[in-house]
């Protein structure tokens, strides 16, 4: 595949990554799938600087990120190490709360109104952010 050197239309470039910010809501799995179909992934936050950038663009709205613990431990969707990586949880979070009545606990992470993270029920239809890295090989065939 060819190397992506600039961001697609309607995506925002920042620090050699491209970001797309939804304006409607989807369940986490649907949001994850949407990003994958765009040859991207749900946003992976690796620094305070990236956190502030994303926070600025999403505003005070619950928004999915690419972090979940649906299979046990917390994992970033791109394989970034969770334990040693950047974290920005709200106080007392994640708590895997079962009291919501939607079934099960809380296995997916989202940005809250103030940007800090909370774990929530994965089927809630929140907004989401897709991210893809520039300079990585895209899935599109090269232009001849």
């Amino acid at each position: 595949g060819s190397e992506r050197t600039c961001c697609p239309v309607n995506w925002v470039e920042h620090e050699r990554s491209c970001y797309w910010f939804s304006r409607s809501g989807k369940a986490w799995a649907d949001a994850d799938n949407y990003c994958r179909l765009e040859d991207a992934h749900l946003v992976v936050v690796t620094s305070w600087e990236e956190q502030k950038f994303v926070q600025h663009h999403i505003g005070p709205v619950n928004t999915w990120m690419g972090l979940h613990d649906q299979n046990g431990p917390w994992k970033w969707v791109d394989g970034t190490d969770y334990e040693t990586g950047f974290k920005n949880w709200r106080p007392e979070q994640p708590d895997d709360w079962y009291g919501h009545g939607l079934g099960g606990g809380e296995d997916c992470a989202h940005f809250t109104d103030d940007g800090r993270w909370n774990d929530d029920v994965c089927q809630r239809p929140y907004r989401w952010v897709c991210e893809t890295e520039l300079d990585k090989a895209s899935q599109e065939p090269p232009l001849l």
């Epitope: 619950n62 809250t112 809630r124």
Partner: antibody
Framework: QVQLVESGGGVVQPGRSLRLSCAAS????????MHWVRQAPGKGLEWVAI????????YYADSVKGRFTISRDNSKNTLYLQMSSLRAEDTAVYYC??????????????WGQGALVTVSS | DIVMTQTPLSLSVTPGQPASISCKSS???????????LYWYLQKPGQPPQLLIY???NRFSGVPDRFSGSGSGTDFTLKISRVEAEDVGIYYC?????????FGQGTRVEIK
Amino acid sequence: QVQLVESGGGVVQPGRSLRLSCAASGFTFSSYGMHWVRQAPGKGLEWVAIIWYDGSYKYYADSVKGRFTISRDNSKNTLYLQMSSLRAEDTAVYYCARDAHDFWSGYFAYWGQGALVTVSS
Amino acid sequence: DIVMTQTPLSLSVTPGQPASISCKSSQSLLHGDGKTYLYWYLQKPGQPPQLLIYEVSNRFSGVPDRFSGSGSGTDFTLKISRVEAEDVGIYYCMQSIQIPWTFGQGTRVEIK
């Protein structure tokens, strides 16, 4: 502007079935979660059911679970409530209501005028 | 289920005077996302309910500023600073932190 219009109400005998419809207009129906809320004559409000924007998830009050089914047809901009094994205590005005936002909001900002369902022999 | 308890159940107010309604929940309505999922609705005679206040203290679009909401955790209050004739009806608090969503019994407000 947002409009929700319920239909299908009427008098029905105990044990029988009835289907309510809610025709939506003035917004992108397929982007919003929808609810049914009911109010027995002279009584308070009771939440009945919710359906996700795409119909993927549905939740019900215990009082109607197993008897009522919420559904939607996004191509027709219509919400439904199929009610079976009706009881006298299901007599109420049934309102359809729309989520406040096209993402999880936790409340409804728009309501229909309601459809009266009377269960009586 | 979360039980919502309103007091008083009935209120008779002189026009221009303040009014206050209390709502208590059987569990905290503070969610892990930092929001408190408590709402106030007014149902005027012969009409469907209308949203007044969302997330404890935010006035919905078009709601007069004489309406205000406050509280936290399990104790909440709706205040009308100066009651007008058009404010008559039944006021309901509602929680949506847990399914099933539940309402208070309602507080009937009438004009003296």
